[in-house]
Amino acid sequence: ELCDDDPPEIPHATFKAMAYKEGTMLNCECKRGFRRIKSGSLYMLCTGNSSHSSWDNQCQCTSSATRNTTKQVTPQPEEQKERKTTEMQSPMQPVDQASLPGHCREPPPWENEATERIYHFVVGQMVYYQCVQGYRALHRGPAESVCKMTHGKTRWTQPQLICTGEMETSQFPGEEKPQASPEGRPESETSCLVTTTDFQIQTEMAATMETSIFTTEYQ
C-alpha cells in the first residue's frame, strides 16, 4: 500500500532509508536533454520474496534530439512506494541485500539519469534522520519515521529529533564520529515491524554504511 505523503520534514535534517521494502517504486527520470526510451520502463520496482528481492525494470534514457530507437528493453513493472526525492551526488556502496530480507538495496545509477531520484514508499517503510552539516542533533527519542496504516489511512510517525545550529554534524544511530563528508546519505527502507532485532540490524547498517550519494530534497 502506498504511503500518501512524504516523511516529515525536520528543520536542518535529511532522511534516508537503509533498504527499500518490496513494493517501493523508483521513477525512471532522465536528466535535461534526455527522455525515457519509447516503450521503456516507467519505474523500477523492488520485487521478490522474503529470501531474495531485486529491482525489476531497467530505466533507460535517450537523447531528446533523437528518436527513441536505441537500447529498447521491455519493462517489467512492479509495486510502488511513497515518493521520495533525492539528489544524486556520487556512486554509493550498496547495502548487503541479504541483511534485510524482503528489501532492496539502492539501485545503481543509469546512464543519463536525472539529478534527483523520486521514490514511492509503501506502508512499513522506515527512514532515518540526521542533521545536516553544521547542525547538532538533540535526541528526544528515535530519529526515525515509519509509514503506518491507521484506519485505512497512511501516516508517517514523527521523528524525535531537533537539529541545533552548532558546528558539529550529527550521525545516524550507531555513529559516534562526525561525518567527514558534507554530503547526505542515501534513503532506503526497512521493516515495518520495528522490533529490537530490526532496529539492531538497521543500526548496524547505518553505522557501517559508507558516505552516500544522496542528499534528500523535499518537494
Epitope: 521513477n27 520496482l45 514511492h120
Partner: antibody, heavy 118, light 110 residues
Amino acid sequence: EVQLVQSGAEVKKPGESLKISCKGPEYSFNRYWIAWVRQRPGKGLEWMGIIYPGDSDARYSPTFEGHVTLSADMSLTTAYLQWSSLRASDTAMYYCARLGSYYAFDIWGKGTMVTVSS
Amino acid sequence: QSALTQPASVSGSPGQSITIFCTGTSSDVGGYNYVSWYQQHPGKAPKLMIYDVSKRPSGVSNRFSGSKSGNTASLTISGLQAEDEADYYCSSYTSSSTWVFGGGTQLTVL
C-alpha cells in the same frame, strides 16, 4: 485520502474540440503516471494512454493514438485529455486513474461523461 | 492490441464461490505478473481489487483472491455476498508498455 477530481459532463457536436481534466493532490500528483480509460455506454473498459505530469511524457494505445492528446500542467496538478475533432463514437465515460503498485491503477476519478451528438 | 478474454457473465448463490477467468497471450498475462482485477458497480468508477496477480489492497475483503497459470489469470470470490454483484475487469501490462483490459464479466448473485 488521495483523490482525482474530474471535470463535469460535456455535450458536444461532431467536429467540435474538447478538453477534459483530472486534478490530483498538490503534494504528489506530478510524481505519478496518470492513465485515461474509456467506457462506452454498456461496454467495457478501454485503456487509452498514460502521461507523467512531471515531464509530460505520454504513451498511447494504438487504438487512440492520433485521435486524442494527453497533456498535463504541473502548476495546476492537472492532467488533460483532449480531442481536436470529436466523433459520435467518442460518446463515453472517461476515467482518469493513478498508476500505483505493480502497474495497477489504484485510484480512480469518478469519470467525465462526454456526449457527442448532432 | 486485443482485449483479454473474459466470460460475459457468471452467477452464483450467496455463500458459494465463483471464479472468473481472464485469458491473454504471452505478451501480456503470460509474460508479466502485472495482472490486476477491478470491480465496477453500476454508475460507479472501477475499484482495484487485486494487483500483482494475487495481492489485495488494504480494505479489500480476503474473500477475493487471484492467481495465474500460463496465459490465464483468475479471480475467485468465496462466500458470495449480494454486494459482490457487479462487473469485473481484468487488466494486464503488455510487452509494448501499454495496458489491456478484459471485456468484463457481469457477476449476478442469485
